[in-house]
């Protein structure tokens, strides 16, 4: 997986009037990292993970840059002619990546009311837009505004590409990004479903990175997809992730089922508790 830095800026308008606040969220390697609030823009680490890793570093530069980007996006929203009454949002997402072979990727995406209407590859300067007429109109609108100050556009977008990569490299160098592996805790619970049946749920939590395989096996053999229900892999607020998989089985058949987990090259299997034991905690095999 490449290292990545992702900026997500959102500005709002109400009845055609652009609001003064904005919201910026920064994700580092897919983890919530910094947040710049519309009330007061102070870049601050998100969650215990970021605070532990980042320590007491001051974020003045990040705060200044994020505030500046917020102002730019507000001006862009003001030039969108499609301002109907009510609440509207303009969102700009910028992503840069450094791959294992040191190659880089940078892109920028604009969303209006949550709908993508314009993207740019910040390395090739190539613009793309969806086919819908609304997206085309919005895209023309925004591109024309950005072209009004050709110099600003040229320097601004080159700088965005360079700055993003520079920041990412700086974070990598300072040890902020630890290519860490945190194994999951896995537990299996059972709950009564209907007469004679129980639902068994296998939960994995506290793992990093987010890629994980979690599935049920009967007599050691993988169950078909349609007999299992999966939860999304979600951040748990500690810089790690959680997910689950469930299936329905006949009561008394618990001993035939195991939950199989694979994460970062490590594997473990976890049995189902029988009878009245509600939770059976299992660690690595």
């Amino acid at each position: 997986e490449p290292h990545s830095l992702r900026y997500n800026l959102t500005v709002l308008s109400w009845d055609g009037s652009v609001q003064s606040g904005f919201l910026t969220e920064v994700h580092l390697d897919g983890q919530p990292f910094l947040r710049c609030d519309r009330q007061k823009c102070r870049a601050k680490p998100q969650g215990q993970w970021a605070e532990d890793v980042l320590g007491n570093k001051t974020w003045d530069r990040e705060t200044r840059d994020l505030t500046g980007n917020g102002k730019d996006l507000r001006m862009t929203l003001a030039h969108i002619k499609d301002q109907k009454e009510g609440l509207h949002s303009l969102q700009e997402i910028r992503v840069c990546e450094i791959h294992e072979d040191n190659s880089t990727r940078s892109s920028q995406h604009f969303y209006y009311d949550g709908e993508l209407f314009l993207s740019q590859n910040l390395e090739t300067k190539e613009w793309t837009m969806p086919q819908s007429s609304r997206a085309q109109t919005l895209a023309m609108n925004v591109r024309n505004f950005l072209k009004e100050d050709a110099m600003k556009t040229k320097t601004h977008y080159h700088a965005m590409h360079a700055d993003c990569l520079q920041e990412l490299r700086r974070y990598l160098k300072s040890g902020v990004v630890l290519r860490r592996t945190v194994p999951p805790m896995v537990n299996v619970t059972r709950s009564e479903a209907s007469e004679g049946n129980i639902t068994v749920t296998c939960r994995a939590s506290g793992f990093y990175p987010w890629n994980i395989t979690l599935s049920w096996r009967q007599d050691g053999v993988s169950l078909s997809h349609d007999t299992q229900q999966w939860g999304d892999v979600l951040p748990d607020g500690n810089g790690t992730y959680q997910t689950w998989v469930a299936t329905r089985i006949c009561q008394g058949e618990e001993q035939r089922f195991t939950c199989y987990m694979e994460h970062s090259g490590n594997h473990s299997t976890h049995p189902v508790p029988s009878g009245k034991v509600l939770v059976l905690q299992s660690h690595w095999q």
Partner: antibody, heavy 118, light 107 residues
């Protein structure tokens, strides 16, 4: 520490019966089934079947029906293998092995040698 | 029943040797294969499950691989403690069946 402790060696005459015990330590007995495996002298391993320690339901492999009975005494975390009408070909070491997920024999008893000889 | 055929039945090797034991199934078993080690007069011990997953406490010199009908157990550098008989076991279908065993003896 997980352990399965089996009863001692038995010398029986043809036609007699034998009951081998397997006592589990170190885990919740009713969370895992119990397998029985036969190893005749100088031979490989042959799976005899398993018993669900929660429901008490036995499953016998072909060739181990009729004279072979798996049973339980869950209050003392013990599984039993009973063989009746013993024959010379029943001479073997019998192992109990914890049935993990009904596919894996993850912990084994030390084995019980049953010798059938007149 | 699925027949499991192990080869060789006996293997003579020295400490430090790389040893490979093969297990062939009479039909595809989709990696549903375990390996056990047994020493004379002792119970078998689980080494590897699901073709390649080492059981807890098993040294990393043991590894498993394979697919379809052909599977191998490899000991990268044979140690004195490794002289024993090794069995494969399939769990793709009932009944569970074992290979005939491979005895690894001192050359």
């Amino acid at each position: 520490q997980i352990q399965l402790v089996q009863s001692g060696s038995e010398l029986k005459k043809p036609g007699a019966s034998v009951k081998v015990s397997c006592k589990a330590f170190g885990y919740t007995f009713t969370n895992y089934g119990m397998n029985w495996v036969k190893q005749a002298p100088g031979q490989g391993l042959k799976w005899m079947g398993w018993i669900n320690t929660y429901t008490g339901e036995p499953t016998y492999a072909q060739g181990f029906t009729g004279r072979f009975v798996f049973s339980l005494e869950t209050s003392v975390s013990t599984a039993y293998l009973q063989i009746s009408s013993l024959k010379a070909e029943d001479t073997a070491v019998y192992f109990c092995a914890r049935n993990y997920g009904n596919y894996l024999f993850d912990y084994w008893g030390q084995g019980t040698l049953v010798t059938v000889s007149s | 029943d699925i027949q499991m055929t192990q080869s060789p039945s006996t293997l003579s090797a020295s400490v430090g040797d790389r040893v490979t034991i093969t297990c062939s199934a009479s039909q595809g078993i989709s990696n549903y294969l375990n390996w056990y080690q047994q020493k004379p007069g002792k119970a078998p011990k689980l080494l590897i499950q699901y073709t390649s997953l080492l059981h807890s406490g098993v040294p990393s010199r043991f590894s498993g691989s394979g697919s379809g009908t052909e599977y191998t157990l490899t000991i990268s550098s044979l140690q004195p403690d490794d002289f024993a008989t090794y069995f494969c076991q399939q769990y793709s279908k009932f009944p569970r069946t074992f290979g005939g065993g491979t005895k690894v003896e001192i050359k």
